[in-house]
């Protein structure tokens, strides 16, 4: 490794980002104690002045929500944490360069799975992010990632699957057997930045075919 670290008071300062919610996290290290307090600062790439994050000064928890401070998804940011423990000198560590566009992971989509007699409908709900457009409205994942598409799978049994893919939000798997349980999975993909969400999974049973009862 290229760094010899002997401070022991503060380690692993990094951003954890999901759907553009950007949380700064860190570990205390072996020398930290219950009275160790942490203060957080942040800045944009190329800026000289570090800005103190209100609400994250002399705190004891090991995380700080910097979503609002880092909400420009085309910008690069840094954050740093200063740890102070009674009787010892302060220790400061900074993050690597952070871009939410590059580094955020995508959560599973929010999906409604609707069973019918011989089909299953899947409705994908738009995912709002904290990212703002120029006119101030919250952007959806689809608006940020223009190449975003959905991959849907329906597991009929252990050996047979049906597949659908697309950019639209409404899908229907047709030609299914009534009164049968199926396992659906829906994944978000953004190929340009090689992002892939974990799947949303729904277990759903087609409705029984009642038509014979009335013939």
């Amino acid at each position: 490794h290229t760094t010899v670290d002997t401070s022991g008071l503060l380690q692993h300062v990094k951003f954890q980002s999901s759907n553009f919610e950007n949380i700064l996290t860190w570990d205390g290290g072996p020398a930290s104690t219950s009275d160790t307090v942490y203060s957080v600062e942040y800045k944009k790439y190329g800026e000289r002045k570090w800005l103190a994050k209100a609400g994250c000064q002399r705190i004891t928890q090991k995380f700080c929500n910097l979503t609002m401070e880092t909400r420009n998804h085309t910008e690069f940011y840094y954050a740093k944490v200063t740890a102070v423990s009674a009787g010892g000198p302060p220790v400061t560590k900074m993050t690597d360069r952070f871009s939410s566009l590059q580094h955020t992971t995508i959560k599973p989509p929010d999906v409604t799975c609707i069973p019918k007699v011989r089909s299953i409908q899947m409705l994908v709900h738009p995912t709002l992010t904290p990212v703002l457009s120029e006119d101030g409205h919250q952007l959806t994942l689809e608006e940020i990632f223009h190449d975003l598409f959905y991959r849907l799978e329906l597991h009929v049994n252990h050996t047979y699957q049906m597949h659908l893919e697309g950019k639209q939000r409404e899908y229907e798997f047709l030609g299914l057997t009534p009164d049968t349980e199926f396992l659906g999975s829906i994944t978000i993909l953004t190929p340009i930045l090689s992002k892939e969400s974990a799947p949303y999974v729904c277990r759903v049973k087609t409705l029984p075919d009642r038509t014979w009862a009335y013939s």
Epitope: T2, T3, K44, G46, T74, K93, M94, D96
Partner: antibody, heavy 116, light 113 residues
Framework: EVQLVESGGGLVQPGGSLRLSCAAS????????MNWVRQAPGKGLEWIGE????????TYNQKFKGRFTISVDQSKNTAYLQMNSLRAEDTAVYYC?????????WGQGTLVTVSS | DIVMTQSPDSLAVSLGERATINCKSS????????????LAWYQQKPGQPPKLLIY???SRESGVPDRFSGSGSGTDFTLTISSLQAEDVAVYYC?????????FGQGTKVEIK
Amino acid sequence: EVQLVESGGGLVQPGGSLRLSCAASGYSITAEYMNWVRQAPGKGLEWIGEINPSTGTTTYNQKFKGRFTISVDQSKNTAYLQMNSLRAEDTAVYYCARFDAYFDYWGQGTLVTVSS
Amino acid sequence: DIVMTQSPDSLAVSLGERATINCKSSQSLLYSSNQKNTLAWYQQKPGQPPKLLIYWASSRESGVPDRFSGSGSGTDFTLTISSLQAEDVAVYYCQQYYSYPFTFGQGTKVEIK
């Protein structure tokens, strides 16, 4: 007051190795990125690479990748440039310089001469 | 790599006169997120390390005399010394920090006529 002081330069034979040091004072080295820049005699400036002293993450100019390695010892508040397989054209003054984009503080430089 | 080309290579200016140095980049240095240009200027005197004068193309570094100013956008930039002083004799470099590897111009030597 921020100060950067390089050391470790000198005469080395072609094919040899050298490790340069950059001792930082007046601030914690983990609070800003550190870079190495070189300047051949009578020539311009050439960026070698950078390190985030907190994480050890490095970015190099492709020209130097493989032969040159940047590292940090946080306890000594010091950055290093390890140079291997040195050639005559590596003869230059080597500077460490602080910051992540442009460079606000520079050391005085240390001269490396590669000659047989 | 982004290539930085300065002109002229050297210039001689009378004391009190204006000195103008140009720097051209092989691609735009306009940083879309803040609409600023990722360009810095340095002054280097003989036997000394470079000294930061200007960053973001036009922001003057603290302590730098106001006779130094930077301008330009996109690919064309200028460093102007409005009234040359004897202590301004040096080599001046531009540097881009738009993308890796960071690159410098070849330098412009400013002398007194």
